[in-house]
């Protein structure tokens, strides 16, 4: 018996072109949890039942709330750990599959609104008992970084956690650095030494003496990373060059990229470019069907008709989305607005507003321009279910009471120095540069750069 | 005064789409949803699903997931019930029912019924 | 789902008679129904909201009555235009449903 530990470190856009708008807006604050399913890793044991070692639900994560014109960063995390214990022998090959999900909250209070964000899926070997293993999956845009670990739970040790060890509370007559065994009580066990020099966090060992690799580690002592080298043999000492006396295979050589994935070179490995329905660091992970069980609340998976959806969830009465996992409750068609809070009163639905808002749907905006006053010469702008006072010049803050400093946001260009006035600001230009903002540079001959009229 | 009226009777054939449209008129369309029930020759009535105009959320009855959309057009006060890959079980008479959105009534106005047959 | 099932399915009456229609939802629905009336040819018409409250513009000869599960229409002396068909509805959960009608004819 153990426990498979799972620890999201971060969860946000991936790199590249098209960064996802984040899954949180200002009008509907939302928070994250995760789930993670865990099957064994043979290929054979791909019929059993939907995460047949064990599947775990996290927290939800902290409030989100997406701060207009900003880019997506990494979303706030669930505290702890996900844990799956699991009863019998540890696997040592294992497939996974990470789920994000999405609880919007604002309006949809009175009943969670939950939508998957991204599935990222996997296929390892991990021997129990050895350090966290790191891993980033990309599933879209989206970009998951996470570590994992199997541990035995007391008496079991070994990599499987098949064998049982329990400290006796009478003195040992094993010498130091053996521990007594059960259930052969008589006999010592020496713990368990790899090779000399095996990486702990890249290498395990199940017999004394021998150096197994994980998964994207090769060598002697599993320290080089798998296709990080292009050399079968290195220069010699005297070359102060590096490079190859005789080309050897690169990372793409015989296409490790499996189900028809393309395969590009990056600098320090190789990248694959799957195709639909498969990912995976090789594409070796086939779309997520019906034998993951992707449906929730009872809801009946039927397989899909073409890659595009491998699966589809026939939802029982009261639950929908695709995967099942909302909750249908009278509360569900958002009654309430502006984040008010809808309250099922058995007879009817009542919203609770946030303060600022009224009506029996909150949709009167309390602070809205019609009873609003702008300091200063200010007018009042509505937009959006929102408002704000559009102020005179050197006049900010909310109403537009406070005095604003006009040379704050550095107005002036290329080293001109700005200087407060009481109608404004003005700029002291550095020497070669003109105009209000001093914008434009002065021309040796006199003329400036203006822009043609 | 509350209307509710829905566009003409469709003859379609199996396999063919029909959008049925709903335009609301003598009340707040956003304050309350729209029901769409459905009523086959000579049977009884069958809630098909509800739509918030107002957000766009809608929830389907089961039997109704897949074929059929229901949709608003906020600007124009228009809902709307699209059925595709038409089948000779859909012919029917299909209904759209206001209701207030926080649950204060029941269905209290009703379309006048919009008939679509689907026939080879 | 919720079934709601509706007795009788047909009656005949005469002008003037007091017509009673019941209706059983499979579990309790807290007063969230309705009853319906609707003419040969015509779109359903509101009768009744929250199990006992009346429609603007519905005669006060209808009334509704009953909580939990069990739920009663009656119209207290028939009148000509009253022979139609009448349906209940639950809109306590998702999906609503509706009996399946009871038919008033002229006896």
């Known amino acids: 018996a153990g426990v498979f530990e799972l620890q999201i470190h971060s969860f946000g856009p991936g790199p590249g072109p098209g960064a996802p708008r984040s899954p949180c807006s200002a009008r509907l604050p939302c928070r994250l949890f995760f789930r993670v399913c865990l099957k064994p890793g043979l290929s054979e044991e791909a019929a059993e039942s939907p995460c047949a070692l064990g599947a775990a639900l996290s927290a939800r994560g902290p409030v989100y709330t997406e701060q207009p014109g900003a880019p997506a960063p990494d979303l706030p995390l669930p505290d702890g750990l996900l844990q799956v214990p699991f009863r019998d022998a540890w696997p040592g090959t294992f497939s996974f599959i990470i789920e994000t999900w999405r609880e919007e909250l604002g309006d949809q209070i009175g009943g969670p609104a939950w939508s998957l964000l991204a599935r990222v899926a996997g296929r390892r070997r991990l021997a129990a008992g050895g350090p966290w293993a790191r891993d980033i999956q990309r599933a879209g845009a989206w970009e998951l970084r996470f570590s994992y670990r199997a541990r035995c739970e007391p008496p079991a040790v070994g990599t499987a956690c098949t064998r049982l060890c329990r400290p006796r509370s009478a003195p040992s007559r094993c010498g130091p650095g053996l521990r007594p065994c059960a259930p052969l009580e008589d006999e010592c066990e020496a713990p368990l030494v790899c090779r000399a020099g095996c990486s702990p966090e890249h290498g395990f060992c199940e017999q004394p003496g021998e150096c197994r690799c994980l998964e994207g580690w090769t060598g002697p002592l599993c320290t080089v990373p798998v296709s990080t080298s292009s050399c079968l043999s290195p220069r010699g000492p005297s070359s102060a060059t590096t490079g190859c006396l005789v080309p050897g295979p690169g990372p793409c050589d015989g296409n490790p990229c499996a189900n028809g994935g393309s395969c590009s070179e990056t600098p320090r490995s190789f990248e694959c470019t799957c195709p639909r329905g498969f990912y995976g660091l090789r594409c070796e992970v086939s779309g997520v069907t019906c034998a993951d069980g992707p449906c929730f609340n009872g809801g009946l998976c039927v397989g899909g008709a073409d890659p595009d959806s491998a699966y589809i969830c026939h939802c029982p009465p009261g639950f929908q989305g695709s995967n099942c996992e909302k909750r249908v409750d009278r509360c569900s068609l958002q009654p309430c607005r502006n984040g008010g809070l809808c309250l099922d009163l058995g007879h009817a639905l009542r919203c609770r507003c946030r303060a600022g808002f009224a009506g029996p749907r909150c949709e009167h905006d309390l602070d809205d321009c019609a009873g609003r006053a702008c300091a200063n010469g200010g007018t009042c702008v509505e937009g959006g279910g929102a408002h704000r006072c559009s102020c005179a010049l050197g006049f900010g803050g909310r109403d537009c009471r406070e005095r604003a400093d006009p040379c704050a946001a550095r107005p002036c260009a290329h080293g001109g120095r700005c200087y407060a006035h009481f109608s404004g600001l003005v700029c002291a230009c550095a020497p070669g540069y003109m105009g209000a903002r001093c914008e434009f540079p002065v021309h040796p001959d006199g003329a400036s750069a203006l822009p043609a009229a | 005064e509350v209307q509710l009226v829905q566009s003409g009777s469709e003859l379609k054939k199996p396999g063919a789409s029909v959008k049925v449209s709903c335009k609301a008129s003598?009340?707040?369309?956003?304050?309350?949803?729209m029901n769409w029930v459905k009523q086959a020759p000579g049977q009884g009535l069958e809630w098909m699903g509800i739509?918030?105009?107002?957000?766009?959320?809608?929830i389907y009855n089961h039997k109704f997931k897949g074929r059929f959309v229901l949709s608003v057009d906020k600007s124009s006060n228009t809902a709307y019930l699209q059925i595709s890959s038409l089948k000779a079980e859909d012919t029917a008479v299909y209904y759209c029912?206001?209701?207030?959105?926080?649950?204060?009534?029941?269905?209290?106005?009703w379309g006048q019924g919009t008939t679509v047959t689907v026939s080879s | 789902d919720i079934q709601m099932t509706q007795s009788p399915s047909s009656l005949s009456a005469s002008v003037g008679d007091r017509v009673t229609i019941t209706c059983h939802a499979s579990?309790?629905?807290?007063?969230?129904m309705g009853w319906l009336q609707q003419k040969p040819g015509k779109a359903p018409k509101g009768l009744i909201y929250?199990?006992?409250n009346l429609e603007d513009g519905v005669p006060s000869r209808f009334s509704g009555s009953g909580s939990g599960a069990d739920y009663t229409l009656t119209i207290s002396s028939l009148q000509p235009e009253d022979f139609a068909d009448y349906y209940c509805?639950?809109?306590?959960?998702?999906?609503?449903?509706f009996g399946g009608g009871t038919k008033v004819e002229i006896k």
């Open positions: 003598g009340y707040t369309f956003t304050d309350y949803y």
């Open positions: 579990q309790g629905i807290s007063g969230n």
């Open positions: 739509i918030n105009p107002y957000s766009g959320v809608t």
């Open positions: 029912a206001r209701q207030d959105s926080l649950l204060d009534y029941a269905m209290d106005y």
């Open positions: 509805v639950q809109y306590a959960q998702f999906p609503y449903t």
């Open positions: 929250h199990g006992a």
